[in-house]
Amino acid sequence: FKVATPYSLYVCPEGQNVTLTCRLLGPVDKGHDVTFYKTWYRSSRGEVQTCSERRPIRNLTFQDLHLHHGGHQAANTSHDLAQRHGLESASDHHGNFSITMRNLTLLDSGLYCCLVVEIRHHHSEHRVHGAMELQVQTGKDAPSNCVVYPSSSQDSENITAA
C-alpha cells in the first residue's frame, strides 16, 4: 500500500479548527492477523529525509496519538489525554486517516507527518509516511477559514519508507 496526502499545505486563521488528512492507497490486507498502527507527529524539513525527526504535537508524542486496529475496522482516539489538548485522530473504513486540531494558535504552524505501519502477527512489515505543512496566520492577511492546497499528483503518491 501507499500513503497519499491529498493536501500539501493548510493555511488557517488563529482560533480555527483543522483536519489534516492522509489516505491509504492500493490493496490493504484485511486478514485476521493483519493490523495497522497509525499515528501523527511534527517534524522539520530534513535535508536527508522528510519526517525522519519526530517531535510531539501539543506535547503529545506519536505514541499518545496512535491508533491500532484491524484492516477492516474504523478507529479514533477516545482517550481524554488527546482531547484535553484539543486533538483527535481518526481512521475510517475507506483508508482515510486524519488528525483534528482545535483552536489553532501560531505555535501549531509547522510540518506534520502521518505514519502508517502494517503489522502481520506481531511483525512490523511495511512502514510508510506522508507530510504536509500547516501555516497558522493572524491579522488582516489571515484567511477567514482554512484554505487547503492540493498536493501535486507526484507529491501525493510519493512514499518514503519510515
Epitope: H32, T35, Y37, Q63, H68, L115, H122, S124
Partner: antibody
Framework: QVQLQQSGAELMKPGASVKISCKAT????????IEWVKQRPGHGLEWIGE????????NYNEKFKGKATFTADTSSNTAYMQLSSLTSEDSAVYYC??????????????WGQGTLVTVSA | QIVLSQSPAILSASPGEKVTMTCRAS?????MHWYQQRPGSSPKPWIY???NLASGVPARFSGSGSGTSYSLTISRVEAEDAATYYC?????????FGGGTKLEIK
C-alpha cells in the same frame, strides 16, 4: 496505567494441574495478545504461547502443546494458563505479558510480576 | 525455530566503562528487541526495533545491528545497569529469547 496482576505462588504435587491467572487493567484487554513466558533458574526466558482475548485465538510453542492451555475472560479482563501433568521440569516462574505496539513495533510491553510454581512430592 | 545466541554469558565491568554485548540469530531478521531484567524483578522492555530506546531508558544505552548480528552497547556503565539483558525475535513462531547476558558491576 497498564498493569498485569498475577496470582500467587503455588506448591503442587507431581501429576497435578495448576491454573495461573493474569488480571489486566488500564487498556482494552480484548484487543491485545497476552503472552505467557517461562523462566527457570539458569534457563533464561522461554515463550510458551499466546491468546488474543477478544477472539480466543491461541498460538502455542510446539514444545508446550499438551502442557499449557490458555483461556481468557473478557468480562473480568483476566487471562488464564493451565499447566497439566506437572513434573519437576515445570517448576519455574511464569510471567504473563501484554503485547504493546510501540512506534508500530509490537513487543512484550507490559509484564506481570510472575507466579512461582514449585512441583515437589 | 530461530535460535538467538547471546555472548558473553557474563560481562563484568567497572563504572564508567564501555560495554558491548551481542546477539546472533540462526536466521536473518529485520530487527531485534531487547529487555532488561534486574534480579528479583520482571523483565522490562528496553530497546525496540534494534536501535530505539524505550521510554525512560538512559541515553547511554544504544543498539545496532542487522541480519543475523545485533548488539547492545552501554557507553558508560553505571551501578544501576547491573542486570541480565535478553534479545528477542518476533519474526516466526516459536518466538524466542536469547539466553541472556548478565552484566555485573565491579
Amino acid at each position: 496505567q497498564v498493569q498485569l496482576q498475577q496470582s500467587g505462588a503455588e506448591l503442587m504435587k507431581p501429576g497435578a494441574s495448576v491454573k495461573i491467572s493474569c488480571k489486566a487493567t488500564g487498556y482494552t484487554f480484548s484487543r491485545y495478545w497476552i503472552e505467557w513466558v517461562k523462566q527457570r533458574p539458569g534457563h533464561g526466558l522461554e515463550w510458551i504461547g499466546e491468546i488474543l482475548p477478544g477472539s480466543g485465538s491461541t498460538n502455542y510453542n510446539e514444545k508446550f502443546k499438551g502442557k499449557a492451555t490458555f483461556t481468557a475472560d473478557t468480562s473480568s479482563n483476566t487471562a488464564y494458563m493451565q499447566l497439566s501433568s506437572l513434573t519437576s521440569e515445570d517448576s519455574a516462574v511464569y510471567y504473563c505479558a501484554s503485547e504493546e505496539v510501540y512506534d508500530g513495533y509490537p513487543w512484550f510491553g507490559y509484564w506481570g510480576q510472575g507466579t512461582l510454581v514449585t512441583v515437589s512430592a | 525455530q530461530i535460535v538467538l545466541s547471546q555472548s558473553p554469558a557474563i560481562l563484568s565491568a567497572s563504572p564508567g566503562e564501555k560495554v558491548t554485548m551481542t546477539c546472533r540469530a540462526s536466521s536473518s531478521l529485520s530487527y531485534m528487541h531487547w529487555y532488561q531484567q534486574r534480579p528479583g524483578s520482571s523483565p522490562k522492555p528496553w530497546i525496540y526495533a534494534t536501535s530505539n530506546l524505550a521510554s525512560g531508558v538512559p541515553a547511554r544505552f544504544s543498539g545496532s545491528g542487522s541480519g543475523t548480528s545485533y548488539s547492545l552497547t552501554i557507553s558508560r556503565v553505571e551501578a544501576e545497569d547491573a542486570a541480565t539483558y535478553y534479545c528477542q525475535q518476533w519474526s516466526s513462531n516459536p518466538y524466542t529469547f536469547g539466553g541472556g547476558t548478565k552484566l555485573e558491576i565491579k
